[in-house]
C-alpha cells in the first residue's frame, strides 16, 4: 500500500494557497493511465466531454493531456518554511479551453470549458511515488484526491491516519 | 534558514557497515522528499537514494540495491544511510539533499555540506 | 535507464564571453531538468529547475533552455565568480546527473 502523508496537517494553509505566477512554471504533453494501466480517454458526447478509464485494443492511441505546472505559496505562518514553503499545482486540459474541475458536492471529476484565469477547481496538488507516478490533491478539498470508481473519474477522500490502500488514486504519466 | 547537517563518515574496511546520519532545520521536515547524492574523489555527482515524505517509498541506485538503505525519522528531522557491505567504489562524499517542492520528487533544493566515506583496508 | 551526456567536458572562455553549455538525454526527459553549479570544496548548488526557471537567489545571467532530448544552459556574460562544474540532472524518470561541465577563465 502506498501512504499520503501529511494530508491533515496543512489543510487551512492549502485552502490559503496561492498560485505564484500566473504563467505556469513549465507545460508538456502526457498520456495518463491508472496504477493499473488502464488509459484514461475522453469523448465528446451530446456537446460534452465525458471522461473513461479502459482498457485500450492494441495499437489503439492514447489520448493527450496537457499538464501545466504552477508553484504555489504556503503562507509562511501556516507552513513553518518561510518563503521556502512551495507546493506544485497541476491542471490538465485534454483539449483546448476545456479543464479537469473536481465537483466537490458531487465527489465526481468533470471537463469543463472555462478562460483563464481558471477557478481553483481547476487547481491540483501534484503528490509523487516516483517521478512518473503521480496523484492529484484538490486545492479546493484538501484529503481528497483524483481517483477511480466504477471505471470512471471520482473523487476519493484519502484519510491518512489508516493503513489504506491507495492504488486507485495513483495515475502514471507517459509521453506515449 | 533551511540546514543539512551529514555526520557518520569515516575510514572502513570492506565489507563492514556504516550508517550516515542527517539531521534537517529550518523547515517543515515530513513535507518533503529526501535524498542521498555521492561524488567520488574527483569524479561527478551520482544520486544514491530516495525516500518519499512519509517513508514510505524508497528507491536506489542498482549498485547500492541490497547493500544500502534509506530511512527516515520525521519526529526527529533526520534521514539515514546505512551502507552495508562497504566496497572500495562506494569511496566518496556522501551528501544529504532536500526537495525541492511539498510532496514531489523533483529537483535539489538544498545541499549538506557532506560527509567523506572512506573504504580502504 | 536514461543517460545524460554533458558537452563539451571543458570549456574555456573569458571574462564576459556568452557560454552555452549542452545536455543531451538518451530519452525524452518532458522538462524534467535541472542545473547544478559545483564549485571546488563546496557542495553542489541549484541553478535552474524544469529547464528554464531561476532558483531563487541565481544572477540572471544563468539562463536554461530547451525539450525533449536537448537543453542548454547559457552564461549570458561569464564572470570570475562562474568558475565551476555544471551538472544536468534528469528527474522524469529515475534520477540521472550529467558527467560535468567543468567551466574556465581564459
Known amino acids: 500500500a502506498f501512504g499520503i502523508s501529511g494530508v491533515q496537517k496543512y489543510t487551512r494553509a492549502l485552502h490559503d494557497s496561492s498560485i505564484t505566477g500566473i504563467s505556469p512554471i513549465t507545460e508538456y504533453l502526457a498520456s495518463l493511465s491508472t496504477y493499473n494501466d488502464q488509459s484514461i480517454t475522453f469523448a465528446l458526447e451530446d456537446e460534452s466531454y465525458e471522461i473513461y478509464v479502459e482498457d485500450l485494443k492494441k495499437d489503439e492511441k492514447k489520448d493527450k493531456v496537457l499538464l501545466s505546472y504552477y508553484e504555489s505559496q504556503h503562507p509562511s505562518n501556516e507552513s513553518g518554511d518561510g518563503v521556502d514553503g512551495k507546493m506544485l499545482m497541476v491542471t490538465l486540459s485534454p483539449t483546448k479551453d476545456f479543464w479537469l474541475h473536481a465537483n466537490n458536492k458531487e465527489h465526481s471529476v468533470e471537463l469543463h470549458k472555462c478562460e483563464k484565469p481558471l477557478p481553483d477547481q481547476a487547481f491540483f496538488v501534484l503528490h509523487n511515488m516516483h517521478s512518473n507516478c503521480v496523484s492529484f490533491e484538490c486545492k479546493t478539498d484538501p484529503g481528497v484526491f483524483i481517483g477511480v470508481k466504477d471505471n470512471h473519474l471520482a473523487l476519493i477522500k484519502v484519510d491518512s491516519s489508516e493503513n489504506l490502500c491507495t492504488e486507485n488514486i495513483l495515475f502514471k504519466l507517459s509521453e506515449t | 534558514e533551511v540546514q543539512l547537517v551529514e555526520t557518520g563518515g569515516g575510514l572502513v574496511q570492506p565489507g563492514r557497515s556504516l550508517k550516515l546520519s542527517c539531521v534537517a532545520s529550518?523547515?517543515?521536515?515530513?513535507?518533503?522528499?529526501m535524498y542521498w547524492i555521492r561524488q567520488a574523489p574527483g569524479m561527478g555527482l551520482e544520486w544514491v537514494s530516495s525516500?518519499?515524505?512519509?517513508?514510505?517509498?524508497?528507491y536506489y541506485l542498482d549498485s547500492v540495491k541490497g547493500r544500502f538503505t534509506i530511512s527516515r525519522n520525521n519526529a526527529e528531522n533526520t534521514v539515514y544511510l546505512q551502507m552495508n557491505s562497504l566496497r572500495s567504489e562506494d569511496t566518496a562524499t556522501y551528501y544529504c539533499a532536500r526537495g525541492h517542492y511539498y510532496y514531489t520528487s523533483y529537483s535539489f533544493a538544498y545541499w549538506g555540506q557532506g560527509t567523506l566515506v572512506t573504504v580502504s583496508s | 535507464d536514461i543517460q545524460m551526456t554533458q558537452s563539451p567536458s571543458v570549456l574555456s572562455a573569458s571574462v564576459g564571453d556568452r557560454v552555452t553549455l549542452s545536455c543531451k538525454a538518451s530519452h525524452n526527459i518532458n522538462k524534467h531538468l535541472d542545473w547544478y553549479q559545483q564549485k571546488v570544496g563546496e557542495a553542489p548548488k541549484l541553478l535552474i529547475y524544469f529547464t528554464n526557471n531561476l532558483q531563487t537567489g541565481i544572477p540572471s545571467r544563468f539562463s536554461g533552455s530547451g525539450s525533449g532530448t536537448d537543453y542548454t544552459l547559457t552564461i549570458s556574460s561569464l564572470q570570475p565568480e562562474d568558475v565551476a562544474t555544471y551538472f544536468c540532472?534528469?528527474?522524469?524518470?529515475?534520477?540521472?546527473f550529467g558527467q560535468g561541465t567543468k567551466v574556465e577563465i581564459k
Open positions: 525516500i518519499n515524505n512519509d517513508g514510505g517509498n524508497t
Open positions: 540532472f534528469q528527474y522524469n524518470s529515475g534520477w540521472t
Open positions: 529550518g523547515f517543515t521536515f515530513s513535507n518533503y522528499w
